[in-house]
Amino acid sequence: DVERTTCPPEKEVHEIDESLIFYKKRELEACVDAALLAAQMDRVDAIPFTYEQLDVLKHKLDELYPQGYPESVIRHLGHLFLKMSPEDIRKWNVTSLETLKALLKVSKGHEMSAQVATLIDRVVVGRGQLDKDTVDTLTAFCPGCLCSLSPERLSSVPPSVIGAVRPQDLDTCGPRQLDVLYPKARLAFQNMSGSEYFVKIRPFLGGAPTEDVKALSQQNVSMDLATFMKLRREAVLPLTVAEVQKLLGPHVEGLKVEEQHSPVRDWILKQRQDDLDTLGLGLQGGIPNGYLILDLSVREALS
């Protein structure tokens, strides 16, 4: 913490301007009034403060707003945003997309994924839901940031907004997030024709249940291996060899290349070896011919 000193009269600050770059840390602490700083935050980013000086300015704002900064200050943080921790940001209430845009621009090129994720979370909370304007802002200024939101936050996305989401925006989404988004996408694209539907639903298929994957296998979609390997393990395991062959079409050859990777490996182990042999790919590890498969989990459920 910066030690408290009294401000020399000749150093008194009446406005935030470039002269402050010549102030030492303790002079900034003693001479800059926090309320003046907050009122003139829009000037701060144009002044080439050192990171040490920015630390002092942050400290002043923290003292003035222990419960979190008001949006009027947040909007003009500029490079001071780089000094914020997720804990600082968690105290904010942000509703303006202009504020979000400004801070996303500042964070670009810096390792701030945790701060950005928290900021986006605060915006969604502040606006009440993940509306189309918010999604459009995220896709434009922060591709992939949609996936920084928790499944709980993503559940506030109305299906009507799903069309604005691009495949690259879902790239870093995990299974739990896709579990939330997939049913919304299914609803949003339900009136589309087969091939158009597949193109749209494909990035969301990591959240699809087995029955939907089975249905796709009947539609000549020729699913690529990248999509197949994003499917939930639980959705892939019950598929038959014939269903996987239909689902992948000409891409079925790729199973050989990926046979060591989950979920392909897990699926192979569940198939009869003679069924796998019908693919002619040399896939190994299936259940040997003549073996009986007992599903003990079913028996336990009955007893």
Epitope: K256, V257, H261
Partner: antibody, heavy 119, light 106 residues
């Protein structure tokens, strides 16, 4: 334009570990596996292993099991390879190479990271 | 493990000359892939799925073969083709490369 940018050369002591990174740009990171290949001076190429960024599923050439640890960070489109218990035999150039899921070839390669293990 | 044997290990050719190098496999494989590597550079994909030219590769390069015998041909040697060429297989685990053919310009 697709690029795989690897970390710089490393000079390390025997018995230590090193972590090499490979940052991908210009395409969908999760549509490709990231593979790693070793090349000792004047010798051929040796496949170390690969990782699927979607599932973090890894496979290793048995020869490098326990020697190499592959990880990815999807949020930064970066793949990592940690090499442990280093000996002079690990002195080589290490390449990351991108492999489209379901395809058996490497369409883009990093520039290589030279690792020298010497006391 | 599948072993890929490339021959010759070293060869030289004059500009304009036709060049053929081979990759023999100890077990039948579905496809072979070919790479070119120049000193101090990374390998570059030339041919995938035995005979398909990779993006940006000159048409003087071609690949052929099946089963256990594969070859790479350069219809007319150019100075910039001086490099080491490697074949690779992905039909069986672990995935292996040949020992390389070093092609020099006469």
């Amino acid at each position: 334009e697709v690029q795989l940018q690897q970390s710089g050369p490393e000079l390390v002591k025997p018995g230590t570990s090193v972590k090499i990174l490979c940052k991908a740009s210009g395409d969908t990171f999760t549509a490709y596996n990231m593979d790693w290949v070793k090349q000792r001076h004047g010798q051929s190429l040796e496949w170390i292993g690969d990782i699927n960024p979607n599932t973090d599923s890894t496979i290793y050439n048995q020869k490098f099991e326990g020697k190499a640890i592959l990880t990815v960070d999807k949020s930064s489109s970066t793949a990592y390879m940690e090499l442990r218990s280093l000996t002079s035999e690990d002195t080589a150039v290490y390449y990351c190479a991108r492999r489209k899921l379901g395809r058996g070839y490497f369409d883009y390669w990093g520039q290589g990271t030279t690792l020298t293990v010497s006391s | 493990q599948i072993v890929l044997t490339q021959s010759p290990a070293i060869m030289s050719a004059s500009p304009g000359e036709k060049v053929t190098m081979t990759c023999s496999v100890n077990l039948s494989v579905r496809y072979i892939y070919w790479y070119q590597q120049k000193p101090g550079s990374s390998p570059r994909l030339l041919i995938h799925d035995t005979s398909n030219l990779a993006s940006g590769v000159p048409v003087r390069f071609s690949g052929s073969g099946s089963g256990t015998s594969y070859s790479l041909t350069i219809s007319r040697m150019e100075a910039e083709d001086a490099a080491t060429y490697y074949c690779q297989q992905w039909s069986s685990f672990p995935y292996t490369f040949g020992g390389g053919t070093k092609l020099e310009i006469k």
